[in-house]
Each structure stands twice: as structure tokens, then as C-alpha cells.
Interface confidence: low
Amino acid sequence: AMDLILINSLPLVSDAETSLTCIASGWRPHEPITIGRDFEALMNQHQDPLEVTQDVTREWAKKVVWKREKASKINGAYFCEGRVRGEAIRIRTMKMRQQASFLPATLTMTVDKGDNVNISFKKVLIKEEDAVIYKNGSFIHSVPRHEVPDILEVHLPHAQPQDAGVYSARYIGGNLFTSAFTRLIVRRCEAQKWGPECNHLCTACMNNGVCHEDTGECICPPGFMGRTCEKACELHTFGRTCKERCSGQEGCKSYVFCLPDPYGCSCATGWKGLQCNEACHPGFYGPDCKLRCSCNNGEMCDRFQGCLCSPGWQGLQCEREGIQRMTPKIVDLPDHIEVNSGKFNPICKASGWPLPTNEEMTLVKPDGTVLHPKDFNHTDHFSVAIFTIHRILPPDSGVWVCSVNTVAGMVEKPFNISVKVLPKPLNAPNVIDTGHNFAVINISSEPYFGDGPIKSKKLLYKPVNHYEAWQHIQVTNEIVTLNYLEPRTEYELCVQLVRRGEGGEGHPGPVRRFTTASIGLPPPRGLNLLPKSQTTLNLTWQPIFPSSEDDFYVEVERRSVQKSDQQNIKVPGNLTSVLLNNLHPREQYVVRARVNTKAQGEWSEDLTAWTLSDILPPQPENIKISNITHSSAVISWTILDGYSISSITIRYKVQGKNEDQHVDVKIKNATITQYQLKGLEPETAYQVDIFAENNIGSSNPAFSHELVTLPESQAPADLGGGKMLL
């Protein structure tokens, strides 16, 4: 997508002003263009930094200008670099003294892998010295002084990519400033081939265009454009779309154009010579005047454009009859488009003859990404390419370019895309009032995040049920009434804002939950849940006297806390209890009930109970004896839930007395966890046991606890917390 061009004016430096201009045509770089010395090509050239300035005549161009007094510091190799999406495109060129002892035949030479190549330098000064040839600054070849020919040549019978580089020639007594340079570019592939494996056939690039070995595209010489470089530009214009213009009195005279490899450097069409200041001879045209006109039907030959065909004829030699080719034109593309973030399908529409094909239309994002059409159609007069961006975001805002490149020429149209953030309310809607079948809502649509203006608002609502789909109503006011709701149902609410344009529906805002009022009967009163046995619980309630004549029944739902086990039981309305059976011993159950007619009633609060135990209870835990005085002591303990413990027994006796002389204290309230023993003898050791009883029997104490009362004079410590029986 980057059309980078380096203009070297003039490559042979005398005492006149000389310059390098680097132009990024039809492309807006995010990173600046740089011009620098190419030390890769020539290590030992001048080290001075370059004074790079903005070219005032062009938006995206940089320039280095050397005044005549700096002529001695100019010799060397240079580059211009542009970056797009992190990928660098570098164009190389050279400048040398016009007074050098040798001059190259051409500034650059592009050959295919395997070609038989002669790199030649013309001798312009005769000296009694050996001639030497260097490649990238390293010596490769010398010619004895008596054998230096008029044309000094380096012969490469089978050129390989590693042969590429800057070749220089001079006399041995000379230096960098008397050297002549030429750059050999060796395409990675053999003639007419491209691709990673060089197994694709190149498009026929006309008018001395060069096939790029990585993309298969033609790099067109200055003055030609289109997919095959067949289309000549208007006079004195250049660039991929012929939009750039040479401003000199004689057009592009004295401009050497350097393009990305493997093109190298050449004159613009109509000019030749190392300085591009010689016009083509009659019958020749094109870059470096290398193309010969052989126009059919006696048509005119123009040194810039080649054969000028009469209407109805076309081709390089006007050899084909047919409709005249028409450079493509991009139509119906506004300069500015506002887009909502999300999916975006931009359309590029173009005319021309032949009509552009799917492959010939592309869309370039501001970051340089090239998109190809996802869909394509055409009418008699237009081709329409539809592109798909699955998720366009605000950072994608900027200048996009629709590009069309056919055999009839190339055109690019930049347009500005402004990506908007979809609006989303910051607050959840508020519920002002509810009934059993309606709710009054304040939709709280402002403030919102994202871009306006808001075109419409939707209130979305649904029951909080795994399978219910969202329903919505369009709203214009901030206060809205939702009707036809289900009673005793929890609903979710949220607001969706819509801004203008396609895909303007924002993400729904925060969710508010509310529950509609009940119209069912109230739950049974006086509910009581008690264990009956190891496998049954008994649920009882007060008699129900409904106000209407409708048949009714009690629905009881029980579920196990420990297991995924749930059961619903229907009980006739005239009963006041139900035995829940087939339960598991020592398991906790949650039960609730409601009174149903045709409409379902309101559920009661949850009741919880354990079935009776099927094993002896475990010993009370955390047994502590504290607050000991001369005649009393406090015993505390904890018991485990779920073992149907009905009572706690404390057994104590004076140590050493017979077993049958013990005292038993039975505590029938199992929620009590503390007891004060009284009437004890001072300074006496007691043996204390504590055990729990349930429906199966008593727990087995593991060991006894010892308690020694204090002498009569000592004061007791503070009393501990907990429920206590005195």
C-alpha cells in the first residue's frame, strides 16, 4: 500500500546543487520517512549526518539538498525508508563525482537469477595506473595499467542473489571520491518467476516494468501505471496512480527515479542518460528510452507515451481492435463516513474498461493493512467490492483508501472513517412501583457511556428463568409502565440505547431485578417440622379455610441438604399433616409448603429438621471445667448437630468412692451447653463424666475429667459465656 519513490537529482555531482527527494505518494505514514547513508553498501563513506527537511511542495515528502560548496562530501550510497505496519520499505541510490575516472553504464542494473551479466564502466580519464573494482567496499578485481580497456567489465556468467551489491571502479591511486558506482540487483527468482519457491509465473509487465519476486506484482516505471504497466500516464506525471507531477520546465528532465527493489533506478519515460537529461531519439520511448515504437497503421510515436492509438485500436503497437481502455474511476464514495463500532461492510464501487475484477480492488486501512473483498458483483458499468471488518473500533478511525488497479490503470481514493463508540447506560433502570401484573420503571437512560446522539431507546425485560428470552419495548419517555407481567415472578430489566447508523444498537446497560406481587393464597400457618423416626419427618399445620369455593391442596416440597434429592408431594386440603417418609437417617432436610388452587400459592419460609440418628451420638466436645470455687464449678461443652441428641448427662463422684456413689444430673434441653455444679465439698477431688443421649442410646466417654474444689477462703474467677443451667 506504500508508494515510495526516491528522486536522485543529479546522481553525477559537479559543482551544481544536487538533491535527494523521498516521496510517499498516496499514503499517509504513521512513522516518518527517513533518508540516510547506506553504510551496508559502502562502509567507508562520509560520516556527516544529513540535513533532512520537509519538502514544502508535498505533504508526505522529505528532502536533502547539497549546495555546490558541499560537493566533495556527497559521494556515496544513500537510502530512503518508509515504514508501514512495522515493515520497512527501503529504496537505495548512489551519488558520485562527475569528474570520476570511470562512469557506470547505468546507475542500477536489474537481472534475473541465472542471467549472464556484464557490469560495465566507461573509462573517461586515462591514467598510467592499475584499475581496481570493489564490491560493497571490498576489493574483488584489478586490471594492470597497460590493459585497462575503454569499457571496464565485471563478468558474471550465472548471476546469483549473493552477487548483488554496489560495484565501484577507480584507478588504484584514487579514492572514494574518484570512484564510479553501479548497483547490481539480482532477482531471487529466474526470469518471469516469483513466489517463495519461484514456481509462479509473473504477469507480463510491459513498458519495462519489473516483476516483484515476492508478490508477482509489476513495479511500473515512472510514467506508466496499471496492473501490467500498459497504461501511460498523462505527460510529466508519475507514481502508482500518476498523481505526482514533475514541476520542472521540461517535466521530469534531470530526475533519476529510484523505486523499491527489484526495480532499481531509471529515468522517467522520455528521458535517458546517467543524468536523465537526454531526450529519446525518434522511434524510442519509455524509461531510459529503452523501448522501441513499432506502431501499426502508421500511428504516431510519442517519446513519453509510446504509440498513440486511433479510437477503436489499443495495445502497445495499436495492434488490437476493441473498445478503448478506460482508466478506472472510484464512484459514490463519500469523503467522510461515520461508522458504529462492531461489524462494518464498506463498499468500493468503480467504473472503467475493462471492468475491475475482484482481485483488482482492495481497501487499505490507516495502519496499512490491505483488505480483499469478501463479496463482489458487477453491472454493465460498475464493479462493486464489499469488504468485511468483523469488529471495527475507534482506533481504526482515520484515512482509509479504496484502491483499484487494472490493465487500464490505477486509481486510489482516500476517505475518512470516524468510528463511534456504541452508547450504553451507566445506571440500571429504577423500579418505581409494582403490582401483580405491572411495573412502573424509570429507564435512567442518562448518563451513558459512548457516543450519541441517541436515536431510540429499548427497555429489555425477562423473567429470571434459564430459558426465557428477552422481550423489549421501544420507549420515548423516561417513565414507562410494563404490563401483562406474571405474578410472583422475579424479572430482570435493562436498557439498550440506539444511535444513528447501521449497527447502532449499544450493549444493554446494567441489570435491575424486581419481583411482581403475589396473587396466590398465603402459605399454611403454624407449620411445624419434627422428626418421627430414622426415615420419617412429620410436617403439621393449622387447618386451612380458604375464602373461595375453589378446590385446593397443599403442595409440600422437601429436599436434602446433603444430596441432590428433591420431592414434591400433593396433600389434600382437608388434612393438617403429612408424614415425609423414605428419608435417610441422620440427614438434614429443608421443607416448604404452599396452598394451591388453579393458581399456585405463595411458598412458606424454609423449615429445617434432621431425621433421627441410626448410630450412637458422639461424645460432647470441647469439655471445659472453669470458675471453680470451694463449693461449685462450671462445666461447658459443645455437641455436634445431626445426631438427634435429646439430653446431656453429667455424672460426678468424689474420687476414690464406689461407682454407685455417683450423682447424675440429666439436662433435657440439648441446646444448653453449660451447667454449674453446686454443693461440692471444699478441697475435694471429683471425677466428672459427661455424655450425650439420643434415640439409640448414650455416647461412650473416652476418659473422665478431674475437678478439685478450692479451700473455703479463695474467691472464684469470672464466669464464662454460653447458655447455662443453674
Epitope: 428463568n465 430459558y467 441432590s564
Partner: antibody, heavy 122, light 108 residues
Framework: DVQLVESGGGEVRPGEPLRLSCAAS????????MSWVRQAPGEGLEWVSV????????YHADSVKGRFTISRDNSKNTLYLQMNSLRVEDTAIYYC???????????????WGLGTLVTVSS | EIVLTQSPGTLSVSPGEKATLNCRAS??????LAWYQQKPGQAPRLLIY???NRAAGIPDRFSGSGSGTEFTLTISSLQSEDFAVYYC??????????FGGGTKVEIK
């Protein structure tokens, strides 16, 4: 004890309709979501349709959308699947399955019927 | 649509040995995963829900683990009645509910 019994399967030609039924017992039918799940011969399980306890909300897999309709009659404790425009690829055993959650549908199935075979062939 | 991928397709195990079945989700499903057992000619039977909870009446040799995208069903010591096809099912996204392709556990 929860029981689900499917009926209505059989052999039909492509394009013809068929209606499956599932009789439910042993639980409060109108509080549970119900689904149809099918299994082509020798293949895995594919969820087809779901209906909420009240019958107010339904959802279908894309493969049957517009052709199949799920419904229920809570007074008869019966679930239905109306299948129109049947295709050869609809050949399968159709199971009716009870959602495990009562108060809110959970999306997995604690009880399944034994299934009814639907064969679509020309 | 959330895609569930079960591996291996077939698992050959000797009675008494441990079996480990895997289920991978194409996106995060938290713990919303169930496992079912299906024997030839029978309907599927719920074994595990919420990735690690055993359904009522399921022996404790069956256990489930995992969350997010990687889940495992482990049968600690295979009994003869455990040889069957096992399916995982996600219910994080019910549009649609989806099942894995199944793992067949066969006698080695």
C-alpha cells in the same frame, strides 16, 4: 417415582410431519423445564428443544428451527414435539428429559425417558 | 456455540483399575458441566452436575473435577456395570445446550 414415557415415533417419508408425546408422572410437572434430546443411530446426543415450566418460553436448536415446535399441556402432564418437514437426517431416537431444577431451570437433566425411534426414509 | 471435545474416544480398562475421562470446552463455562452414563439400549443417566457434585444414588467411585475449559470424570475402581459410553454436557450457554462426542469405556 419420576417416570417419562415417550410415544408417537415411527417411519415417515421426507417432508411428512410427526408428533411425539411424553407422559410425565411422579413430580410437579408444571414447575420443571422439559427438553427433547435426540440420538442418531450410533451417534452422540444432540439437544433439540426446551420449554419452560409454564410453557411461556421455548427454544430450539438451529438444525430444527422453523420445522419443530415444542409445547406442553400442564393439565395432562404431557410434553409434545411437533415435527414438520422431516428430513432423512432427523432419523434418531428422541428422548424426553426433565430439567433438574424446580425453582429455576438448571440446564441439565436428572430424569430421561426410554426414547422413541423416528425413522425418515424415502 | 460452545463445542465440547471428549478424549479419548475409546478407553480400554481392566475391572478394578482407574479410568480418567477428559472433556474440553471451546470457551470458559465456569463449572456448568454435567456427566452422563449411557449403556446400550438405555437412556442416559445423570452422574455428576456442576462439574463435581454427584447426583442422588451415584456411587462414590465416580468423581468429577475441573472448571473453566478443562474437566475430568474419574472412576476410581471400575466395576463391570461401569462399562458404557460417557457424555459431558455444558449448560453455561443454553442457546444451544451441547454435548461432547462421548467416550466409550470398554473392558481391556
Amino acid at each position: 417415582d419420576v417416570q417419562l414415557v415417550e410415544s408417537g415415533g415411527g417411519e415417515v417419508r421426507p417432508g411428512e410431519p410427526l408428533r411425539l408425546s411424553c407422559a410425565a408422572s411422579g413430580f410437579t410437572f408444571n414447575t420443571y423445564g422439559m427438553s427433547w434430546v435426540r440420538q442418531a443411530p450410533g451417534e452422540g446426543l444432540e439437544w433439540v428443544s426446551v420449554i419452560s415450566g409454564s410453557g411461556g418460553s421455548t427454544y430450539h436448536a438451529d438444525s430444527v428451527k422453523g420445522r419443530f415446535t415444542i409445547s406442553r399441556d400442564n393439565s395432562k402432564n404431557t410434553l409434545y414435539l411437533q415435527m414438520n418437514s422431516l428430513r432423512v437426517e432427523d432419523t434418531a431416537i428422541y428422548y424426553c428429559a426433565k430439567d433438574s431444577g424446580s425453582w429455576t431451570s438448571s440446564g441439565f437433566f436428572d430424569y430421561w425417558g426410554l426414547g422413541t425411534l423416528v425413522t425418515v426414509s424415502s | 456455540e460452545i463445542v465440547l471435545t471428549q478424549s479419548p474416544g475409546t478407553l480400554s480398562v481392566s475391572p478394578g483399575e482407574k479410568a480418567t475421562l477428559n472433556c474440553r470446552a471451546s470457551q470458559n463455562i465456569n463449572s456448568k458441566l454435567a456427566w452422563y452414563q449411557q449403556k446400550p439400549g438405555q437412556a442416559p443417566r445423570l452422574l455428576i452436575y456442576d462439574a463435581g457434585n454427584r447426583a442422588a444414588g451415584i456411587p462414590d467411585r465416580f468423581s468429577g473435577s475441573g472448571s473453566g475449559t478443562e474437566f475430568t470424570l474419574t472412576i476410581s475402581s471400575l466395576q463391570s456395570e461401569d462399562f458404557a459410553v460417557y457424555y459431558c454436557q455444558q449448560y453455561y450457554d443454553w442457546r444451544p445446550l451441547t454435548f461432547g462426542g462421548g467416550t466409550k469405556v470398554e473392558i481391556k
